[in-house]
Interface confidence: medium
């Protein structure tokens, strides 16, 4: 299954498969997640080392039975792969990284404002796939505002140095945020010139262009079919790059097919998994496993659920078979890709869905061993579970916020229902940024059903929560996906990064936005908050956040909305805009329901009708 | 609809205790705080105390601490107030409210009225 | 404690006429201040809250300003339901009512 703990001060011994430098460990994480071997990691901070050549170290790792010893190293950060964690699973990585230099090939230099622009910039131009920034304080004069655009073979830093007054991060490409638009075309019987940067073998050139696609250096592709005239090279996929970013010529060959790397997509990028199957072909690879199941679909799913399984072929030879069972060859290559593919055989093929983001049906959460006022624009993607819930009466208009936990599901909060209990006016904006962009061709989903807390009551802050079950399951992408709920009773976790959103008042008496705002509202004692609302009862199903000074808070129009924390590098949604004395105000805080408090209510309503939990937990 | 129902009028005796209720309907005590006031004879209100019913918590205003005692019973939704060595300063309404929006919703008050 | 000082503690005005009524803080009480209307055998009414945020259903004569440790109340035009005993309260820290003001028609 999928483990999200983060171990502190212990180092995996062993099981090196590759090594690189990354700025921290959630994207040590990330590398080890889209590495085809990685199961474990263990990353070196600046400061947990001397050695200047193993400072911002990533190791990846692999082992057969799925773990490796730990030994103390102080300040060292160990994890797991995100194989097999649906949703979880992203190449994108937003992080800025101040006082750092990520070294690389420099192949473009220009003078910006900010690092957010760099970044910008960097995303938007097809081989960056890193920056460094340095700011207007920093201590060369002529290279202040500089804006590095970088890329190396690896995709990642060829080292890491701590330098000050620079700030450096990641193309936002695997985000689906550039503008650059891509070549959804796959052209027959072309091949494409250039550098190649890899070869490996797949059945079809959709497979090869997602596998370029996730490729650091791929910016296009060559397919050789399986009837191509040399038989050693059917199958082949190269991927390949260019010193312009496109194929410098294209040459007619018959059974070959080529076509560009999809990172560059806008609001949409391929999910970074093959779910086909393929009849009648044989995947060769090394050997994992052999078990019979029935059928195809089981075999894929027994890979799945294998963490180290790749690929898999399931036989039909009469030999291979039991009754109604089969064999059910598990395997697994160095690049993850078939090391043989024959055709015409009594075999079905396919690959592990361990890299697929869509997760099952069900609900997030995680175990571990009223405009925003003071805010700022978000951007697209920042917050993909977000939604927006709006009335539609004679007019239609934005009410509440809430928050997607599963492919059916949305969090909010039970008093954005008051008199308004009917659900057929109701309709659900997912996957937006601007409600101005909403029109009546805009997809919106609409309530099946509106699950209230018992306890809740007309008027009371007690119990502001309720479910809504969507009549028809969302697929999840970069802008549209659910945020993970604690565990259960979580009060030892100390959230120090925590953010809420939504189009609410700017200010008191304001009116709703049109860009989803953000704001950074540090969590506050019950005991402070209680101090500060004397005749209300701040029990522990709540939890307070807010500013002593004010001035940055959530308001009308927010509720039912998500305050998120970031803890572990992982999303948490840890309150639901609740009621508050006001916005902003001087020593008020914004009063949420705790999410906690509520998991067994969730679990309980989230079941499925045939009594299975639908939830999906990463640990 | 939330109302808050006190008991009658009493008419005690120098030195004497009374208790006085308010029972809640609409809402559950245990969800919010229950507070006393008091209001002497042409004079301004005074905060007495508040208590959690879910857990008998009580805050007290300093000056009527040892004069009042504040309790409640959640299976009749009801708060009380026992007041002690009743003497003329103690004459006055006592009204119980409920939190939760700054004294939004009052009792009618209840007439203690202490002569010998 | 915060003492909360009100004046006038009896006023008389003429119907239609403007009604204001101060409250004085011991110390800065952040506007955390509200409003009562109290009327014989009822409990008190809340009116304002939060220095000047009137509640729900109650009309717009009445009104609120104030900051630091010195705040004041107004009805711009007196109707006769007005007639009562007006309270200030201050919810900085704990709760302390003012002495009242008692309104009369002239």
């Known amino acids: 299954g999928c483990l999200t703990q983060l171990y502190e001060n212990a180092f995996f011994r062993g099981g090196d498969v590759a090594s690189m430098y990354t700025p921290n460990a959630q994207y040590c994480q990330m590398r080890c997640t889209f590495h085809p071997r990685c199961l474990l990691f263990s990353f070196l901070p600046a400061s947990s080392i001397n050695d200047m050549e193993k400072r911002f170290g990533c190791f990846l790792k692999d082992s057969v039975t799925g773990t490796l010893p730990k030994v103390h190293r102080t300040g060292a950060v160990s994890g797991h792969s995100l194989k097999q964690c649906g949703h979880q699973i992203s190449a994108c990585h937003r992080d800025i990284y101040k006082g750092v230099d990520m070294r690389g090939v420099n192949f473009n230099v220009s003078k910006v404002s900010s690092v957010e622009e760099c970044q910008k910039r960097c995303t938007s131009n097809i081989r960056c796939q890193f920056f460094s920034y340095a700011t207007q304080t920093f201590h060369k004069a002529e290279y202040r505002n500089n804006c590095l655009l970088k890329y190396s073979p690896g995709g990642t830093p060829t080292a890491i140095k701590v330098l000050s007054n620079v700030e450096s991060g990641f193309s936002l490409k695997p985000c689906a945020l550039s503008e650059i638009g891509c070549h959804m075309n796959i052209f027959q019987h072309l091949a494409f010139s250039d550098v190649d940067v890899a070869r490996v073998l797949t059945p079809d050139a959709f497979v090869c262009r997602t596998i370029c696609t996730y490729h650091p250096n791929c910016l296009f592709f060559t397919f050789y079919t399986n009837v191509w005239k040399i038989e050693s090279q059917r199958n082949v996929c190269l991927l390949k790059t260019s010193e312009s970013g496109t194929p410098s010529s294209s040459t007619p060959q018959e059974n070959t097919i080529s076509g560009y790397s999809l990172l560059t997509c806008k609001r949409t990028l391929p999910e970074p998994c093959h779910s086909k199957i393929y009849p009648g072909v044989d995947f060769g690879g090394e050997e994992l496993n052999v078990t019979f199941v029935k059928g195809v679909n089981v075999c894929q799913e027994t890979c799945t659920k294998m963490i180290r399984c790749q690929f898999f072929t399931y036989s039909l030879l009469p030999e291979d078979c039991k009754e109604e069972k089969c064999k059910c060859f598990l395997r697994l290559s160095m690049d993850g890709s078939p090391t043989r593919i024959a055709y015409g055989t009594q075999g079905s093929s396919g690959y592990s869905l361990r890299l697929c983001n869509t997760g099952d049906n069900s609900v997030c959460t995680t175990k571990t061993s009223t405009r925003i006022v003071g805010g700022t624009n978000s951007s697209w993607g920042e917050w993909p579970w977000q939604v927006s819930l709006q009335v539609k009466l004679t007019a239609q208009r934005h009410l509440c916020g809430g928050s997607l936990i599963g492919h059916q599901w949305v969090l909010t909060a039970a008093h954005c229902f008051d008199g308004l209990p009917l659900q057929d006016v109701w309709r659900i904006y997912s996957g937006i940024l601007n409600l101005s962009d909403i029109t009546k061709d805009t997809p919106f989903s609409q309530i099946k059903e509106i699950i209230i807390h018992q306890n809740y009551k007309v008027s009371e802050g007690n119990h502001d929560i309720a479910l809504i079950k969507l009549q028809a399951p969302l697929n999840y992408t970069e802008f549209q996906k659910p945020i993970c709920l604690p565990s259960k009773g979580d009060t030892s976790t100390i959230y120090t990064n925590c953010w809420v959103t939504g189009w609410g008042f700017s200010k008191e008496k304001g009116e709703i936005q049109n860009i989803l705002q953000k704001v950074n509202i540090p969590l506050v004692t019950n005991e402070e908050c209680q101090k500060r609302y004397q005749d209300y009862k701040i029990t522990q199903r709540m939890v307070c956040a807010g500013y002593k000074e004010g001035g940055k808070d959530a308001c009308k129009g927010d509720s039912g909305g998500p305050l998120v924390c970031k803890h572990n590098g992982m999303w948490r949604l840890v309150g639901i805009t609740s009621w508050g004395e006001g916005c902003a105000r001087r020593e008020q805080p914004g009063v949420y329901t705790k999410v906690a408090e509520y998991m067994d209510w969730i679990l309980e309503k989230t079941q499925s009708s045939d009594g299975k939990a639908q939830m999906q937990s990463p640990a | 609809e939330v109302q808050l129902q006190q008991s009658g009028a009493e008419l005690v005796k120098p030195g004497a205790s009374v208790k006085l209720s308010c029972t809640g309907s609409?809402?559950?005590?245990?969800?919010?705080?229950m507070f006393w006031v008091k209001q002497r004879p042409e004079q301004g209100l005074e905060w007495i105390g508040r208590?959690?019913?879910?857990?008998?918590?009580?805050k007290y205003d300093p000056k009527f601490q040892g004069k009042a005692t504040i309790t409640a019973e959640t299976s009749s939704n009801t708060v009380y107030l026992q007041l002690n060595s009743l003497t003329s300063e103690d004459t006055a309404v006592y009204y119980c409210?409920?939190?939760?929006?700054?004294?939004?919703?009052w009792g009618q008050g209840t007439l203690v009225t202490v002569s010998a | 404690d915060i003492q909360m000082t009100q004046s006038p503690s009896s006023l008389s005005a003429s119907l239609g006429g403007k009604v204001t009524i101060t409250c004085k803080a011991s110390?800065?009480?952040?506007?955390?201040i509200a409003w009562y209307q109290h009327k014989p055998g009822k409990g008190p009414r809340l009116l304002i809250h939060?220095?000047?945020t009137l509640q729900p259903g109650i009309p717009s004569r009445f009104s609120g300003s104030g900051s630091g440790s010195d705040y004041s109340f107004s009805i711009s035009t007196l109707e006769p339901e007005d007639i009562a005993t007006y309270y200030c309260?201050?919810?900085?820290?704990?709760?302390?009512f003012g002495g009242g003001t008692k309104l009369e028609i002239k």
């Open positions: 409210s409920r939190g939760g929006g700054l004294f939004a919703y």
């Open positions: 609409g809402f559950n005590i245990k969800d919010i705080y």
């Open positions: 110390q800065d009480i952040n506007k955390y």
């Open positions: 309260l201050q919810y900085d820290d704990l709760w302390t």
């Open positions: 939060y220095t000047s």
């Open positions: 208590i959690d019913p879910e857990n008998g918590n009580i």
